[in-house]
Each structure stands twice: as structure tokens, then as C-alpha cells.
């Protein structure tokens, strides 16, 4: 059996070397001479001879000065043998635990740590961390128990210790109340972490803690009046620059000012913020009445995007705004005139009398009026009073120039101020129907096949309005009854069913309708039909040789 | 000499609102950090709020979170603690005291608010 | 509960010296120096007799001064008089809010 009792070396030892840990014994040695000999990691495999074993004695030693944190423990096997080299015992593990000196100094894992904290920021609240480590053994002894300490902070306003760091964790914490970005936006500690509880080695690193920006300063009005001046009427025109100055964190939303008229009950005035300067930008956002009101004096007070963190008083500004008189255009009253006229209105009568206000007030201005959009050339103005006439036939039914029974037309009043000023109004004539349009089919041109035909719808149109309309009456004329029938399709009778009464030659073939609208006002039309060689719904139709017939029925 | 002052005690059914003050003197009011400690009849001292000097930060026990409300008025060197859904367990002595030096001193001489039926 | 642990009584007869203890955690007492010791007459407001460990304010008796080892604290008053007697408190530093923990008190009696 082996005696070996536990080995530990110290790290960097001073020597001489090599120098004895234990002696190793087998009890075979009782029996006879033994031999002593090791392998494993630092005796034959590297780091090899940094153990040795006196082959004879059994004595272990070490070569040369050992280094925990490279390696902590040693694996060996000891190894025992007779004088004819046969083992005497089976290898017997070696453990050699390197134990730890105190030749390591912490380490930060940064050189500089950077940390933010709020201006303002109450005592506790925690700001950041910084971390050292130590290669030393911590588990067996002190010598990497690093504790963290603050050496030094700049500036040392508003007072020498703004900052506290957790010994035992590195996490720095605001202990002092008054941090305010605006006198000091940074401070710069420097931070020592020490080994042995602090008491041991050392070693410094810079914290960089950035002082963050709340709303805790206003934005001032510098200076607190202001002029300006604007044309009347004009909207969205600067009419003066207002300034302002902030001791916050520019272009963020602490800084940004939010201006407010507080005396703009008709919103007749905005103002916007310059995004760059902060500028306060006053603006017609209405146009404005010279003849009504000729100045405003404005209270303009300033705030920021965001709300004030702390009680703040806020500035105002007063602007004088003087609105200048300027040649506006006369104004129809109404701007838009509905007047309701028959189609069949006499060509030469006075429809109506459309004229405008003069709004200048201050000016004393002839008005005269003219046409400026007749499409259908239909009347015609008397330029001192305004009275409309009609100089041609009215008609509803002109599609291209009435829309919805509505003829449009604009009429214009021009001063004689300086500039010319022009004002534009609208007329519409409302013209109510007159039965004046028969009815009339659509399509006018129809397809059958010669065999099994399909019956053709028929639509009846009249362009005139109800109660000129349908129910219409229908009738075959001219002998067309012979060959063909017609039936209402609907119960208004909007449209009719056409077809043949018996099978017919392939051939063109015209048939005379008579329509009737509800006023019997009638119209005979020929409708065209072609009669195709196919069967059921005729497509396209392919005719054979036209039947000689001049009118077939 | 720095001094506080605390005032607006008294007897409040629960469910009721008292606010109280504490006047301070002898410093620069709007530089340090102020609280709000009270402590129950027989009991020891419980930390209820704080504020920093500019007022822009506050801080509440979860005892009272929601129903109290600290506030300053710098102008006036004042301290306010409303007070609001008081209840039996805010009977005590409140005190207000200034921060510095990582510690609370001085304090005043602190005011009685008894919260009862 | 307190966050920092006192004794509730202790007490001594005149010109003896007595500590009262007050122990925390690494996160209050163990990680920063600022410990203070206030005392408390019956019906009075605290008074700071201690700060930041062992600093005595200005008007303080040099027969109380504190002491801290590891995560306790300790306040020692030698040469105990009548006036001694009252409660002490300790208070700490710690991150985060609240800023400041207490200690539940000590009542110290004068025989």
C-alpha cells in the first residue's frame, strides 16, 4: 500500500530548487528495494519537469517557482517497481494543489465606463456599474475580495461627494441631491477596486456619468414685444418672428418651445415653431377684416413639448398686429344664385337680377358686370344693374350644357379701385321641363336569326322628365303588325318585346314604331332590322343574297 | 440656524384629507432633497416620502403610494405632504426632515395626525 | 419589520459604557459609509448624534462615537449619563429608494 500524504505548494516560490514537497513510500519496501518514479501533467507531459521523484528515497520535489492562476492542481500517477522492474504496487494518483498568493491587482473590465442619471435624480437612485475582476483565488482566501471605492470626482460641485459606490457590488448611486445639467452636464469619477477587502492591491478606472436633461428650465421670451403688419384677407402670411431662449437640452422635447395665443377666441392667428432656432413663427391663419377690425394685440405665452418636471412660471409675449386696408373684390350676394326658369323661357326677358356688394367701406367704387362663362351663349347682362336676360332658346335637354336640369353660368363684378379688383358669382338656373321630346327606341337596329329566333328587348327613351315620361304606348304602324308582335316588358312600360309572328327570309327588313309618352306626345320611328342566317340569338350575323324587296314587312 | 416647522396636524375621520406643511429656514430650501418621516404611537420610524430640491422627482412608501402626494414650493421655502383616503394606520407623528451628507438631519419637532372614528 | 436589526433594550449604570449593535446587509450597511445613530427623547423629535459612520455633528458629546465592521454597525457611549437615556436609531444609506432603512430602535435604560 501507498503512504502519500496531501501535497500543496505555494505559488512563486523563492527556492532554492529543486526543492522537497513529501516523501512518497510504498510498504513493499519492507519486502525489498524499492523504485520510485512519476508520470502525468509536469512530470512527463508539459509543462514536463516541473515535479521530479528521487528514484530511490521517493522523495517529490518541485523544479522551479509554480503559478496558480496558469495552473491550480496538478494530476500525477507515482509509480513503484522492484529491483527486476516488476510493479510492486499499482499507480497511485497524486493530486498537488497549487495554493494562492496574493500576485494578482484587480482588474476593470473597462478603462472607462460610461453611465447616465437624470438631473434632478433623488439620493438612491442607482446610476451604473462598474466591474473589476481578480485572477486570485477567491474561493480559499481574500486576495481577489475586491471592494470598490470612489478616489475622486470632478467637479467636486455642487458637492465633493455627489456619488456613492457599493463596495461590494460597484454600482454607483446618486447620494447627494442637486445634480442639474445646465451647471454640470458630466462628472468624471475615478473608481478603485482593491483586493483583501480594499485593503490589498489596487487598481483605478474613470466613470463617466453623463447627466441627462429634464424640463426643469423654461422657455423666456427675450424680448417680450413685438410689432407687425399684414394686407387683410391674406391667410397663412408671417407677420412677425418671436424669440425665445431655453436653458435645456437643445432640440429635444424639454428645449422645443409650443407657443399659444391666449387671446385668439376666432383662431384667426397661429403660430408655429421654427424646429431648427425654436423660433416662434406668427401667422394669419385666417384672413383678416380691415373694415371690421384694423389691430390685434396678442398674448403669445411659450411651454415646451413636454410638460415642466419641476413649478416653473411661463413667459409671455405681447404683439401688436396692425391689419392694412387693401382693394377687395366685390362679393355676390348670394355667391351662388339658384333661379328656377321654364325650358320654353322667351327669348329677350329678364330672368333675373344678380349683383354684388362693394366691401370697402372706406372706398366709394363703381361696379360693373359682365358674363365671364355662358357655354350655351344663352344670355346676356346689363352691365351697370346686374339684370340677366335671355338672348336664346333655353333647353333642358341640351345634355352638353345642362347637367341635372342645372345650367351654370358665372357671372363677374369689377370695381374700379386700384389695383382693378374682380368678383365672381354663380348662377344657376334651375330649368324645369317642358314636354318637348318624344319617346324613341334604343337600339334602333336588330338582329334575328332565321331559325327558332330569340324576341329582341327594346328600350324606350325620352329625354324629358316624368311626368313627360313613361308609362309609354307602343304600336306597330304602317302594316309592320303582319309579321311582327310587340309586348310591354315591364309594367312601366319602359320597354317593348319584339319578334317575328312567322319564320322570315334571311334579309334586311325595316318596320315602323309609333311611341306615345304619358302626355301623348308621339313619334313614328323605323327601326332596321336584319333578319341572319343562324339559329336562336343572332351574333354576328352572317346575311345570305339581300332580299330584292325594296321595304319588307 | 437651520430650522423646519411642521404644522397642519390633527384629527380626521377615515376617509378624509389633511395637508400638512413644514416651513424651513437657515438654508438654501431649493438645494437638498426633503422628507417626509412618521413614526406610530410606541413604534419606530418609517420613511414615507421624499422629493428632490427642484421637485421634479418624488418618491413614496408602497404604504402610502396613490394617497399621499409630496410637493415644494421653493419660493416659499415650504414643504406640503397632502395627505388623502387616510386611514387608521396613518395615525402618527409626522416629521419633516432635510437630506444631506447621506443622512437626514435636522428634523423637526413634528406634527400629530390621528386618524379615528 | 426594520431592515436593520437592533437590540431592543439595553443598559448600564452611570460612567459605564455600553454599544447598542445594528446590523444590516451588504447592500446597506456593508456597502457604503454612511451609518448614522439618531437619539430620541420621549415626546421629542431625533436628533443626529452620528453620521457617515463615526463623524459627530457639531454640539455632540465626544462620549458617543460609532464604529462598523462588515455589515454591523455599532454606536458606543462611555461615560454614561442620566441624559443618555432614550432610543437610539440607526439609519443607512441604500441604493435604490427608499434612500435611507432604519433600525427598529434600542431603548437604552440608565440603572
Known amino acids: 500500500d501507498w503512504v502519500i500524504p496531501p501535497i500543496s505548494c505555494p505559488e512563486n516560490e523563492k527556492g532554492p530548487f529543486p526543492k522537497n514537497l513529501v516523501q512518497i513510500k510504498s510498504n513493499k519496501d519492507k519486502e525489498g528495494k524499492v523504485f520510485y518514479s512519476i508520470t502525468g501533467q509536469g512530470a512527463d507531459t508539459p509543462p514536463v519537469g516541473v515535479f521530479i521523484i528521487e528514484r530511490e528515497t521517493g522523495w517529490l520535489k518541485v523544479t522551479e517557482p509554480l503559478d496558480r492562476e496558469r495552473i491550480a492542481t496538478y494530476t500525477l500517477f507515482s509509480h513503484a517497481v522492484s529491483s527486476n522492474g516488476n510493479a510492486v504496487e499499482d499507480p497511485m494518483e497524486i493530486l498537488i494543489t497549487v495554493t494562492d498568493q496574493n500576485d494578482n491587482k484587480p482588474e476593470f473590465t473597462q478603462e472607462v465606463f460610461k453611465g447616465s442619471v437624470m438631473e434632478g435624480a433623488l439620493p438612491g437612485t442607482s446610476v451604473m456599474e462598474v466591474t473589476a475582476t481578480d485572477a486570485d483565488d477567491d474561493v480559499n482566501t481574500y486576495n481577489a475580495a475586491i471592494a470598490y471605492t470612489i478616489l475622486s470626482q470632478d467637479p467636486e460641485l455642487p458637492d465633493k461627494n455627489m456619488f456613492t459606490i457599493n463596495r461590494n457590488t460597484g454600482v454607483i448611486s446618486v447620494v447627494t441631491t442637486g445634480l442639474d445639467r445646465e451647471s454640470f452636464p458630466t462628472y468624471t469619477l475615478v473608481v478603485q477596486a482593491a483586493d483583501l477587502q480594499g485593503e490589498g492591491l489596487s487598481t483605478t478606472a474613470t466613470a463617466v456619468i453623463t447627466v441627462t436633461d429634464t424640463n426643469d428650465n423654461p422657455p423666456i421670451f427675450n424680448p417680450t414685444t413685438y410689432k407687425g403688419q399684414v394686407p387683410e384677407n391674406e391667410a397663412n402670411v408671417v407677420i412677425t418672428t418671436l424669440k425665445v431662449t431655453d436653458a435645456d437640452a437643445p432640440n429635444t422635447p424639454a428645449w422645443e418651445a409650443v407657443y399659444t395665443i391666449l387671446n385668439d377666441d376666432g383662431g384667426q392667428f397661429v403660430v408655429t415653431t421654427n424646429p431648427v432656432n425654436n423660433d416662434g413663427i406668427l401667422k394669419t391663419a385666417k384672413g383678416l377684416d380691415f373694415e371690421a377690425k384694423q389691430q390685434y394685440i396678442l398674448h403669445v405665452a411659450v411651454t415646451n413639448v413636454v410638460p415642466f418636471e419641476v413649478s416653473l412660471t411661463t413667459s409671455t409675449a405681447t404683439v401688436t398686429v396692425d391689419v392694412l386696408d387693401v382693394n377687395e373684390a366685390p362679393i355676390f350676394v348670394p355667391p351662388e344664385k339658384r333661379v328656377e326658369v321654364s325650358e320654353d323661357f322667351g327669348v329677350g326677358q329678364e330672368i333675373t337680377s344678380y349683383t354684388a356688394q362693394e366691401p370697402d367701406t372706406f372706398m366709394e367704387q363703381k361696379i360693373t358686370y359682365r358674363i365671364w362663362r355662358d357655354t350655351a351663349n344663352w344670355l346676356e347682362i346689363n352691365p351697370d344693374t346686374g339684370a340677366i336676360s335671355t338672348r336664346a332658346e333655353l333647353d333642358r335637354e341640351d345634355f352638353e350644357h345642362v347637367k341635372n336640369s342645372t345650367y351654370t353660368a358665372l357671372i363677374i363684378a369689377t370695381d374700379n379701385g386700384s389695383p382693378v379688383a374682380t368678383g365672381t358669382g354663380t348662377l344657376l338656373l334651375i330649368l324645369s321641363d317642358v314636354n318637348d321630346n318624344a319617346p324613341i327606341p334604343e337600339p334602333r337596329t336588330i338582329f334575328f336569326c332565321e331559325r327558332n329566333p330569340k324576341p329582341q328587348v327594346i328600350n324606350i327613351i325620352d329625354a324629358d322628365l316624368p311626368p313627360n315620361t313613361s308609362p309609354f304606348t307602343a304600336e306597330l304602324t304602317h302594316g309592320a303588325s303582319a309579321n311582327w308582335t310587340i309586348q310591354y316588358n315591364d309594367p312601366t312600360q319602359e320597354s317593348i318585346i319584339l319578334k317575328p309572328k312567322m319564320a322570315l327570309e334571311v334579309g334586311d327588313y325595316k318596320i315602323n314604331l309609333k311611341l306615345m309618352d304619358n302626355q301623348n306626345k308621339d313619334q313614328v320611328t323605323t327601326l332596321e332590322v336584319s333578319v341572319c342566317d343562324c339559329e336562336g340569338a343572332a351574333g354576328v350575323c352572317r346575311k345570305a343574297q339581300p332580299v330584292e324587296a325594296g321595304l319588307q314587312i | 440656524e437651520v430650522q423646519l416647522l411642521e404644522s397642519g396636524g390633527g384629527l380626521v375621520q377615515p376617509g378624509g384629507s389633511l395637508r400638512l406643511s413644514c416651513a424651513a429656514s437657515g438654508f438654501t430650501f431649493s438645494s437638498y432633497a426633503m422628507s417626509w418621516v412618521r413614526q406610530a404611537p410606541g413604534k419606530g420610524l418609517e420613511w414615507v416620502s421624499a422629493?428632490?430640491?427642484?421637485?421634479?422627482?418624488?418618491y413614496y412608501a408602497d404604504s402610502v403610494k396613490g394617497r399621499f402626494t409630496i410637493s415644494r414650493d421653493n419660493s416659499k421655502n415650504t414643504l406640503y405632504l397632502q395627505m388623502n383616503s387616510l386611514r387608521a394606520e396613518d395615525t402618527a407623528v409626522y416629521y419633516c426632515a432635510k437630506w444631506g451628507d447621506g443622512t437626514l438631519n435636522p428634523w423637526g419637532q413634528g406634527t400629530m395626525v390621528t386618524v379615528s372614528s | 419589520q426594520s431592515a436593520l436589526t437592533q437590540p431592543a433594550s439595553v443598559s448600564g449604570s452611570p460612567g459605564q459604557s455600553i454599544t447598542i449593535s445594528c446590523t444590516g446587509t451588504s447592500n446597506d450597511v456593508g456597502a457604503y459609509n454612511y451609518v448614522s445613530w439618531y437619539q430620541q427623547h420621549p415626546g421629542k423629535a431625533p436628533k443626529l448624534m452620528i453620521s457617515?459612520?463615526?463623524k459627530r455633528p457639531s454640539g455632540v458629546s465626544n462620549r458617543f462615537s460609532g464604529s462598523k465592521s462588515g455589515n454591523t454597525a455599532s454606536l458606543t457611549i462611555s461615560g454614561l449619563q442620566a441624559e443618555d437615556e432614550a432610543d437610539y436609531y440607526c439609519s443607512s444609506f441604500t441604493s435604490g429608494l427608499p434612500w435611507v432603512v432604519f433600525g427598529g430602535g434600542t431603548k437604552l435604560t440608565v440603572l
Open positions: 457617515e459612520v463615526n
Open positions: 422629493i428632490s430640491g427642484s421637485g421634479g422627482s418624488t
